[in-house]
């Protein structure tokens, strides 16, 4: 878990200032109003398959 400004959270997670740690974006399904969910919406997880142009 990284403090903001030092290194990003791992893929699929986002920094929570409220909890002072990286949190799983998956939990935004149950708790969409969590502060870190804004960061999840901005950087959605990569799709299962990359679609080539």
């Amino acid at each position: 878990e990284q403090a903001p400004g030092t290194a990003p959270c791992s893929r699929g997670s986002s920094w929570s200032a409220d909890l002072d740690k990286c949190m799983d974006c998956a939990s935004c399904r149950a708790r969409p109003h969590s502060d870190f969910c804004l960061g999840c919406a901005a950087a959605p997880p990569a799709p299962f398959r990359l679609l080539w142009p």
Epitope: G12, D18, C25, A26, S27, A30, H33
Partner: antibody, heavy 119, light 111 residues
């Protein structure tokens, strides 16, 4: 260090009541959903009840097997979780675990407290 | 309610073996992005411990020999090289909806 410490278990007769407590420390208790999970002797895990946050009006959910008999509650000012168990049956005999989680996966577990329902 | 079927219910293995445990849900527990399936380890007389959440996310402090995979209804927990401390019972659990349900458990014993 995260700690969940259950208490209140013991021997009770069928039809009796018991109140379990769970004292939490080491995490922001008021931000975490809490549940009770039980395990009958030699058996698997069974989710019993859940309580959410003040912002959710302390919404509660129960397994069908305990609905109407058990009541989950919390006191955020005391970092404590409770389970009031009424009309106890032999099949309620189990180790009861207090669990804490932000959502979904149960990150934090207590050591458990044994409830024995027998005459 | 969603039923969780774990297999096998028990297995015997040796230190260094690759071990695979499967869990099947009676309906999908995945969205297009995430799977709401989690794995726990329990040793005798102890509380369960979270190993993997959201099907494949290793919990902090859990050795990298543990891995999880799967989506929809079929999920797998793999221990790449079994260590003496891994002999325990493993449970899957979904959090797709209330009630949360656990698999029946898989006891990993020493051969």
């Amino acid at each position: 260090e995260v700690q969940l410490v259950e208490s209140g278990g013991g021997l009770v007769q069928p039809g009796g009541s018991l109140r379990l407590s769970c004292a939490a420390s080491g995490f922001t208790f008021s931000s975490y959903w809490m549940s009770w999970v039980r395990q009958a002797p030699g058996k698997g895990l069974e989710w019993v009840a859940e309580i959410r946050l003040k912002s959710d009006n302390y919404a509660t959910h129960y397994a069908e097997s305990v609905k109407g008999r058990f009541t989950i509650s919390r006191d955020d000012s005391k970092n404590s979780l409770y389970l009031q168990m009424n009309s106890l049956r032999a099949e309620d005999t189990a180790v009861y675990y207090c669990t804490g989680y932000y959502a979904d996966a149960m990150d934090y577990w207590g050591q458990g407290t044994l409830v024995t329902v027998s005459s | 309610d969603i039923q969780m079927t774990q297999s096998p219910s028990s297995l015997s293995a040796s230190v260094g073996d690759r071990v695979t445990i499967t869990c099947r849900a009676s309906q999908s527990v995945s969205t297009s992005s995430y799977s709401y399936m989690h794995w726990y380890q329990q040793k005798p007389g102890k509380a369960p411990k979270l190993l993997i959440k959201y099907a494949s996310n290793l919990e902090s402090g859990v050795p990298s020999r543990f891995s999880g995979s799967g989506s929809g209804t079929d999920f797998t927990l793999t221990i790449s090289s079994l260590q003496p401390e891994d002999f325990a019972t493993y449970y899957c659990q979904h959090s797709w909806e209330i009630p949360y349900t656990f698999g029946g458990g898989t006891k990993v014993e020493i051969k």
